[in-house]
């Protein structure tokens, strides 16, 4: 039986049940390399409290559909008096990066995971030439996730004092230049995640090979190497390589530019101070507020919730968008879709799509950007579920009693972008460091 998601096969992935202090290792095509789980375990559960291991999914007992992967075991479990077997169930959804398996819940018998990944899309539009896992768990099992930094198009310029060269990088995947045929970036070879431009020539100085690593709690490392043989003539016989160290700052700050800290014989060392390197709970909340000692800030968008069936309306040329954020009030137009953002076609108001649902909500404050994300909307033809990204700006003089109003800014591959100027986005910082 062929592997259902070949792009995910090269790595052993991790997921965590934080509530119960459980680390899962997942290898969807072969087996995880953990002796205590046996030679054919595809899903190995490590109970950190008791320091014990159990296989909760056997690679031999795999069954797959386009969107669901199940690994059974021969271990019995008692669920309401019936004799079941322990199993793991991974639900796959289309995403724009390789993504990460997320632990959902576990019963006596079944361990449930969800994975939004390019590997599950119906079309290849989001697939990279080369991409590696872009998250890591630290020793306290806290997740550090750089997926939001991955550019699907374009690159980051590395700050370098050399006026004759430009070093471009992407995070965890190769650079896609197709959307910008006119720039210097266009000359970069396919597959490169680190591209050095000198004059009119561009050179591959590194491709992703291994996933993100944690060196200590607040420092993450990504290494790129040039896969091709054939040395570059300006590298003095050495093979090019790039090391990017992502550093979580000691207190809240605006984002910074990746900086070249050392360069020798085509070995490039880059340091990037960014809050995306911090653990995810520092940056994100499933509610509409971020506060407390853990986050160093106080943000509360709940006053933006609309009551009494009214919604914010944002004009998107062909479409009208109805938004009801930070609540669970049904949008009247949206046919009981549990939508936080609802897209209605102006020329045919019966064409209604959920562009993100209110129970799929993430509030993120990172590198000075405050963003509210709604995902899990109606599917597009690619298989990607529509989602909405609302970028908030602090405006103490916003109209509508300080609430302001969302403005639709555009759509990229079934992701809808809005900006929203409001006094409720004015962030209060706690300086307790």
């Amino acid at each position: 039986q062929a592997a259902p998601f070949p792009e995910l096969c090269s790595y052993t992935w991790e997921a965590v049940d934080t509530k119960n202090n459980v680390l899962y290792k997942i290898n969807i095509c072969g087996s995880v390399d953990i002796v205590q789980c046996g030679p054919s375990s595809a899903v190995c559960m490590h109970l950190l409290k008791t320091r014990t291991y159990h296989s909760v999914g056997d690679s031999v007992l795999r069954s797959a559909t386009r969107s669901l992967l199940e690994f059974n075991t021969t271990v019995s479990c008692d669920q309401q008096g019936t004799n079941h077997r322990v199993q793991s169930s991974i639900a796959f959804l289309c995403g724009k990066t390789l993504g990460t398996p997320e632990f959902v819940t576990a019963t006596e018998c079944v361990h449930y995971f969800e994975w939004r990944t390019t590997a599950a899309c119906k079309k290849d539009i989001f697939k990279a030439n080369k991409e590696v896992p872009c998250y890591v768990f630290d020793e306290e099992l806290r997740k550090h996730d750089l997926n939001p930094l991955i550019k699907l198009s374009g690159a980051y310029l590395v700050d370098d004092s050399d006026p004759d060269t430009s070093l471009f990088i992407n995070v965890c995947r190769d650079i896609d230049t197709l959307r910008d045929p006119g720039s210097q970036l266009r000359a970069c070879p396919p597959g490169t995640a680190a591209c050095l431009v000198r004059g009119h020539q561009a050179f591959d100085v590194g491709q992703p090979r291994d996933g993100l690593k944690v060196v200590r709690k607040d420092r993450l490392v990504l290494s790129y190497v040039r896969e091709e043989a054939g040395k570059l003539d300006f590298c003095d016989g050495h093979s090019p390589a790039v090391t990017i160290t992502f550093v979580c700052p000691s207190e809240r700050r605006e984002g910074t530019i990746p900086k070249l800290t050392a360069k020798s014989n085509c070995r490039y060392e880059i340091e990037w101070i960014t809050e995306y390197a911090c653990h995810r709970d520092y940056l994100e909340s499933k509610t509409c507020s971020l506060s407390g000692e853990q986050q160093d800030v106080s943000i509360d968008l709940t006053p933006l919730a609309q009551s009494g069936g009214s919604s914010y309306i944002s004009d998107g040329k062909e479409y009208l968008f109805y938004l009801n954020v930070c609540g669970e009030t049904e949008i009247q137009f949206c046919n009981k879709k549990q939508a936080a953002v609802c897209q209605v076609k102006k020329s045919d108001t019966s064409q209604v799509k959920a562009a993100g649902r209110y129970h799929n909500q993430t509030l993120r404050y990172s590198d000075g950007d405050l963003t509210l994300i709604y995902f899990g909307g109606d599917e597009c033809s690619s298989g990607f579920q529509r989602m909405s990204v609302i970028n908030f700006e602090c405006n103490k003089t916003a109209g509508n009693d300080g609430k302001g109003t969302p403005v639709f800014t555009g759509e990229v591959d079934c992701t809808y972008f809005f900006t929203w100027d409001t006094e409720y986005a004015c962030v209060h910082h706690h300086h307790h460091h």
Epitope: A155, R179, D180, S183
Partner: nanobody, 123 residues
Framework: QVQLQESGGGLVQAGGSLRLSCEAS????????WGWFRQAPGKEREFVAA????????SYADSVKGRFTISRDNAKNTIYLQMNSLKPEDTAVYYC????????????????WGQGTQVTVSS
């Protein structure tokens, strides 16, 4: 690829103000970072100001800091450059440009350009 069209240039006295506009069409507004550049006769094209697509973060050339303001109206797919306290040395053709590179002010990293609009500041 995105298409850009500048407007708003003209002749103004030193100390005066102008507001340049740049309307974008074609590819989506949302995947690009935006910049204003200028080129005076016989000189290289130089960076003036930039704004990131994903937020309203801005950067400015030292020579215009405090006098020029870059902004955008996403609903209209338009970038603006508000120029106050203009000086004769601000005389140039002003170009709007779009880039898929984050954190850059280098004109060669901008793949889409407008035709430019002339700004002349008389003393």
């Amino acid at each position: 690829q995105v298409q850009l069209q500048e407007s708003g240039g003209g002749l103004v006295q030193a100390g005066g103000s102008l507001r340049l506009s740049c309307e974008a069409s074609g590819r989506t507004f949302n995947t690009y970072n935006w910049g204003w550049f200028r080129q005076a006769p016989g000189k290289e094209r130089e960076f003036v100001a930039a704004i990131r697509w994903s937020s309203s973060k801005t950067s400015y050339a030292d020579s215009v800091k405090g006098r020029f303001t870059i902004s955008r109206d996403n609903a209209k797919n338009t970038i603006y450059l508000q120029m106050n306290s203009l000086k004769p040395e601000d005389t140039a053709v002003y170009y709007c440009a779009a880039s898929i590179v984050d954190f850059t002010t280098n004109p060669s990293h901008f793949g889409s350009w407008g035709q430019g609009t002339q700004v002349t500041v008389s003393s």
